[in-house]
Amino acid sequence: FGISGKHFITVTTFTSAGNIGEDGTLSCTFEPDIKLNGIVIQWLKEGIKGLVHEFKEGKDDLSQQHEMFRGRTAVFADQVVVGNASLRLKNVQLTDAGTYTCYIRTSKGKGNANLEYKTGAFSMPEINV
């Protein structure tokens, strides 16, 4: 879902699933600003103190990152200015499942949206001809 209205910006997320041991993406988009320096992205996970990831002033700020995500997260930095706040999660673990919040702040206002991230041992079905 997204929040919109006065002093709020629309943020959109999509429920997604991650394959254990592989890399996953938590999708989040917002109406982009034209410039980069006003954009702050924070990813949070329900039940976890500290941040999953933070991007501000054009670069990552991992000073408040929770240790369970250390070295495993990245945003698509070159795409932030076009409204992509999606999070890349490396080496997905079973414990990564849960409710995440994508929080965005720009010069116009702020907004957030939640997504449910499912993890498991998913595989493509084999097709025999």
Epitope: P32, I34, N37, G38, G58, D78, V82
Partner: antibody, heavy 116, light 107 residues
Amino acid sequence: EVQLLESGGGLVQPGGSLRLSCAASGFTFSSYGMHWVRQAPGKGLEWVASISSSSGYIYYADSVKGRFTISRDNSKNTLYLQMNSLRAEDTAVYYCARASSGMDVWGQGTTVTVSS
Amino acid sequence: DIQMTQSPSSLSASVGDRVTITCRASQSVSSAVAWYQQKPGKAPKLLIYAASIRESGVPSRFSGSGSGTDFTLTISSLQPEDFATYYCQQYYSTPLTFGQGTKLEIK
């Protein structure tokens, strides 16, 4: 093919007005911010104004603030620049450009000449 | 406002030469820098964005590097079609600003 096509330039007297248009095709116009950039004869590039995809963010260069207005009509895939109180120093080729990480698509430009 | 200072303002080189153009921002712009090529009478063309990412369709002889305040555009082996004017631009903050340009001429 992704294309931007400017129109509306011409010769105008100081103090006059012009409205530039930029018709977009070949991409989802409503998903992109847009810019106007100008280039005076023999000079470098100068950013003029920008507008985000849904018009939520609008910015102007100090040199045109209060005189120029950027707008867009997503239903018509068109970007506009309303230019009032034109001055000799506004004489330039005006380009529209698509906002990405940088300006990834440019129109061919339309020439504005301000002279008496 | 952030000033983008390009150097040199003009440069003479020969086909096959390696050429480097630098751009210095008056304050940190992270990696929010783009490079453009412009030929006479034509619109600029995006070469590099996010300081180092080559735009689709741009030849691999063009490369960008840098972050913070110092940025470089390198052409590894000049081709005849590369003689043009090159501009850097920051999109970190408004007003968006361009360098003054570097005119690359045939020696």
